[in-house]
């Protein structure tokens, strides 16, 4: 998602015109401008592909288009966490990878994308109505989720290119603060720019070196990668029936290494209650005193270590957990 704004070039004031005050007034817009330019909306893309070699095998690939550091990725099926999903894999940059059959191989592809192979044979293939969801928890953006599936008519070996799916949910707790500050900053910046516009030159002029005013642009991947990513999202085509109830809003994900000690009653959801949340179904980041954070949902009182806030500087594969285990 890219937003562009025409912003006239800011020229430093001529010496002596406003002195120190002038400098100070223009440092702030520069800082704010930088913040505005770098503060784009993150996105999650999901790609589901049926393997041509093994017709009952699926590969799910997900990526996060955002500038924050990823602290956790959860892949589930049946719908977004908290709305009918059971966790298939959870990937943590430091603590490794957890996966549940029929997930066969979950791995980090890059620091911001993962892939998961799902196996099945005949009856154990995922269903036609199965949606796969990827949820990325990142700092400071919060938690973002997108879902995808394979088109019913898809040929084996083919897939829709990855796409940011429409089901995107940001964790308010994680982003409201940052967004609020940035929004305020951007508004303030515009206000300053307008004030400068109505003042005599040479406060603000078009850049002499560029025929066109430079563009401030919110964070986005390169246009090439964006083009590759923006396509309709996909779903799975297999041989089992849809759920008989529409009221299913099962679960979130597993309690990771542990969860926050909360004192909620036993949660009503099932198979994947790690990221399960009370309604509204948003994962909510909770900061913990010791600098760790975990996902708190409606769950039994758990205690234990939380999630490490910062991923391993060596990157996601620095430690892939006990996954010599399969």
């Amino acid at each position: 998602m890219r937003t562009e704004a025409q912003v006239p070039a800011l020229q430093p004031p001529e010496p002596g015109l406003e002195g120190a005050m002038g400098h100070r007034t223009l440092v702030l817009p520069w800082v704010l401008l930088t913040l505005c330019v770098t503060a784009g909306t993150p996105e999650v893309w999901v790609q589901v592909r049926m393997e041509a070699t093994e017709l009952s095998s699926f590969t799910i690939r997900c990526g996060f288009l955002g500038s924050g550091s990823i602290s956790l990725v959860t892949v589930s099926w049946g719908g977004p966490n908290g709305a009918g999903g059971t966790t298939l894999a959870v990937l943590h940059p430091e603590r490794g990878i957890r996966q549940w059959a029929p997930a066969r191989q979950a791995r980090w592809e890059t620091q911001s994308s993962i892939s998961l192979i799902l196996e099945g044979s005949g009856a154990s293939s995922p269903c036609a109505n199965t949606t796969f969801c990827c949820k990325f928890a990142s700092f400071p953006e919060g938690s973002w989720e997108a879902c995808g599936s394979l088109p019913p008519s898809s040929d084996p070996g083919l897939s829709a290119p990855p796409t940011p799916a429409p089901i995107l949910r940001a964790d308010l707790a994680g982003i409201l603060g940052v967004s609020g500050v940035l929004l305020f900053g951007c508004v303030y910046l515009l206000h300053l720019l307008r004030r400068h516009k109505h003042r005599p030159a040479p406060r603000l002029q078009p850049s002499r070196t560029s025929p066109q005013a430079p563009r401030a642009r919110a964070w986005a991947p390169s246009q090439a990668s964006q083009a590759a990513l923006h396509v309709p999202y996909a779903t799975i085509n297999t041989s089992c029936r849809p759920a008989t109830l529409d009221t299913a809003h099962p679960h979130g994900g597993p309690s990771w290494w542990a969860s926050l000690p909360t004192h909620a009653a036993h949660r009503p959801q099932g198979p994947a209650a790690w990221a399960s949340t009370p309604i509204p179904a948003r994962g909510s980041f909770v900061s913990v005193e010791n600098g760790l954070y975990a996902q708190a949902g409606e769950r039994p009182p758990h205690t234990g270590p939380g999630l490490t806030l910062f991923p391993d500087p060596r990157g996601p594969r620095a430690m892939e957990g006990p996954l010599g285990v399969r």
């Epitope: 099926w77 049946g78 009918g84 059971t86 966790t87 603590r95 490794g96 990878i97 957890r98 996966q99 549940w100 059959a101 029929p102 099945g120 009856a123 154990s124 293939s125 995922p126 269903c127 109505n129 199965t130 089992c240 029936r241 849809p242 759920a243 109830l245 009221t247 299913a248 809003h249 099962p250 679960h251 979130g252 994900g253 597993p254 309690s255 990771w256 290494w257 542990a258 969860s259 036993h266 949660r267 009503p268 959801q269 099932g270 198979p271 994947a272 209650a273 790690w274 399960s276 769950r299 758990h302 205690t303 234990g304 270590p305 957990g321 006990p322 996954l323 010599g324 285990v325 399969r326």
Partner: antibody
Framework: EVQLQQSGPELVKPGASVKISCKAS????????IHWLRQSRGKSLEWIGY????????GYNQKFKSKATLTADNSFSTAYMEFRSLTSEDSAVYFC???????????WGQGTSLTVSS | DIQLTQSPASLSVSVGETVTITCRVS??????LVWYHQRQGKSPQLLVY???NLADGVPSRFSGSGSGTQFSLKINSLQSEDFGSYHC?????????FGGGTKLEIK
């Protein structure tokens, strides 16, 4: 109250198949994975696999993938395990259990005793 | 697959005594370990989840400790209903595996 009620004991011949049922009550069936485990006499518990009733998709322990078929019938809130090509090694007590959030099994069936004998 | 080694395999103790059962895991599973109690001819009952959390309705004389690869279950002041088998199980990834079990008998 959450309850898992399993079908009765089975005595079958080697090479035959058996289908054991596990009827759930007291909670929304489609919301929880139902797992199947077995315990041979004097041995530890072994995990066979699970079925996710919401979409009917199972996940298997590779050891049992060619031996077991796990299904669910949401209209009857019942999970099934079919075990085929039975040998005396398959004589055991088979349990179904409800999984809570990839964290633990909080409710178990009473067990179904399977005896494979000629 | 992750291996769980439970010790001791059997234990003969008297009512009122304190016992500790250990479970060693072949890989770091953080706190993803569960303990069950099983009476003869019955199904297992959840005691402890997440390594240290007591399940609903479980008496406080039971306690779980440990994380990573080493876990233990402690039972203070054993009661007659505590006899039977104890199993540890990891919940890290599938395939889920169990320890060999510890049989607790009355002395």
């Amino acid at each position: 109250e959450v309850q898992l009620q399993q079908s009765g004991p089975e005595l079958v011949k080697p090479g035959a198949s058996v289908k054991i049922s596990c009827k759930a009550s007291g909670y929304p069936f489609i919301n929880y994975n139902i797992h199947w485990l077995r315990q041979s006499r004097g041995k530890s518990l072994e995990w066979i696999g699970y079925v996710y009733p919401y979409n009917g998709v199972p996940g298997y322990n590779q050891k049992f993938k060619s031996k077991a078929t796990l299904t669910a019938d949401n209209s009857f809130s019942t999970a099934y395990m079919e075990f085929r090509s039975l040998t005396s090694e398959d004589s055991a007590v088979y349990f179904c259990a409800r999984e809570r959030g990839r964290d633990y099994f909080d409710s178990w069936g009473q067990g179904t005793s399977l005896t494979v004998s000629s | 697959d992750i291996q769980l080694t439970q010790s001791p395999a059997s234990l003969s103790v008297s009512v009122g005594e304190t016992v500790t059962i250990t479970c060693r895991v072949s890989a770091n599973i953080y706190s993803n370990l569960v303990w069950y109690h099983q009476r003869q001819g019955k199904s297992p009952q959840l005691l402890v989840y997440g390594g240290t959390n007591l399940a609903d309705g479980v008496p406080s004389r039971f306690s779980g400790s440990g994380s990573g690869t080493q876990f233990s279950l402690k039972i203070n002041s054993l009661q007659s209903e505590d006899f039977g088998s104890y199993h540890c199980q990891h919940f890290w990834s599938t395939p889920y595996t169990f320890g060999g079990g510890t049989k607790l008998e009355i002395k």
